[in-house]
């Protein structure tokens, strides 16, 4: 039994890191393998992650971690029984994929303005709380070409757009994702989408 693709890990910079790897053949990850991990820290202890299958030869492990700080470094040991298959390390701050924003809501009762709000996925004491920026994706369910992205580069988790920038009388969906420039993170997953019917008063045309 050998590792074909070494484990690569990403952290949510809060409490979970996800590691994925591939074996050289079909493997029952949960019965044959164990991923041991330990924070390099005087008061830490070793933990064991039981991997799940991720395709025939692929394995994935969700590591529960202490609250992350930038200096953290974890040792990783992949075992098959008594055989050490791979040994490595992982710095969560260097491989961050933020959590997805939540609670996306579209407020349509503000005089021909659409107000989209969502929740920051981090608690206020987390470093990323004040460092996230967002992308909001709005698209028409009726017209695949009617697809737009709004970049929200300020910290407030909200976006205002004029209802008239979208077509009236049709349904739209929106979703939002996050990233943090400070740690050069990847984008988060998209939030669940929310749907609304766009309608606004057309201005009278004067001839």
């Amino acid at each position: 039994m050998k590792v074909l693709q070494e484990p690569t890990c990403v952290s949510d910079y809060m409490s979970i890191s996800t590691c994925e790897w591939k074996m050289n053949g079909p493997t029952n990850c949960s019965t044959e393998l164990r991923l041991l991990y330990q924070l390099v820290f005087l008061l830490s202890e070793a933990h064991t992650c039981i991997p799940e299958n991720n395709g025939g030869a692929g394995c994935v492990c969700h590591l529960l971690m202490d609250d992350v700080v930038s200096a953290d470094n974890y040792t990783l040991d992949l075992w098959a029984g008594q055989q050490l298959l791979w040994k490595g390390s992982f710095k969560p701050s260097e491989h961050v994929k933020p959590r997805a924003p939540g609670n996306l809501t579209v407020h349509t009762n503000v005089s021909d303005t659409l107000l989209l709000t969502w929740s920051n996925p981090y608690p206020p004491d987390n470093y990323l709380y004040n460092h996230l920026t967002y992308a909001v994706n709005i698209w028409s369910e009726n017209d695949p070409a009617d697809f737009r992205i709004y970049n929200v580069t300020y910290l407030e988790p909200s976006l205002r757009i004029a209802a008239s920038t979208l077509k009236s009388g049709i349904s739209y969906r929106a979703r939002v994702r996050a990233w943090a420039q400070c740690y050069n993170t990847t984008w988060s997953e998209w939030s669940p989408s929310t749907k609304w019917h766009n309608s606004y008063r057309e201005p009278f045309e004067q001839h």
């Epitope: 830490s44 202490d66 200096a71």
Partner: antibody, heavy 115, light 109 residues
Framework: EVQLVQSGGGLVHPGGSLRLSCAGS????????MFWVRQAPGKGLEWVSG???????NYADSVKGRFTISRDNAKNSLYLQMNSLRAEDMAVYYC?????????WGQGTLVTVSS | EIVLTQSPGTLSLSPGERATLSCRAS???????LAWYQQKPGQAPRLLIY???SRATGIPDRFSGSGSGTDFTLTISRLEPEDFAVYYC??????????FGQGTKVEIK
Amino acid sequence: EVQLVQSGGGLVHPGGSLRLSCAGSGFTFSRNAMFWVRQAPGKGLEWVSGIGTGGATNYADSVKGRFTISRDNAKNSLYLQMNSLRAEDMAVYYCARGRYYFPWWGQGTLVTVSS
Amino acid sequence: EIVLTQSPGTLSLSPGERATLSCRASQSVSSSYLAWYQQKPGQAPRLLIYGASSRATGIPDRFSGSGSGTDFTLTISRLEPEDFAVYYCQQYDHSAGWTFGQGTKVEIK
């Protein structure tokens, strides 16, 4: 808002015992290492003890064998049991949350050791 | 045990002046694990700098940290009235644990 609220200080005779408490809120207590740091009157800061998320502990040589750090994650609380207290243990004791350094501190509680 | 020695013991300066505080370690310290704190009378210490040079949340940019190995420096570019306090450096080591310097008092001249 992160808060560390301390209690349990007071006057104790040499050789006596005292238990300090620190209640945490505004963060996930169980995912954080916790510490005690003290400051004798007019002196500098001295690290006393730390406890990891899994219960691993460490002590300064000056308190080893006399002080015991513990935590109760269900109550979001940190404790320091101090036995065989000496005059040189008299200080303001701070609880702190952190790891390699200490971003969050309690308000401090004074322990007076006097006959 | 790693010993941190701060100098000077007391720094007498006027508001608006630049303050340079030194912290020297008895053996090499990882920059990732070097921090600076400010403490005012009757208050808990406040983290200013971590990782030798990163400002903690809410700390004004007049505070900066630098250094590596055994020599570290905290600089306050222009002293404000509220900056007069005692400053401590602190290190963490995987085997020796946590130690503080003895402190530098920045007082009004």
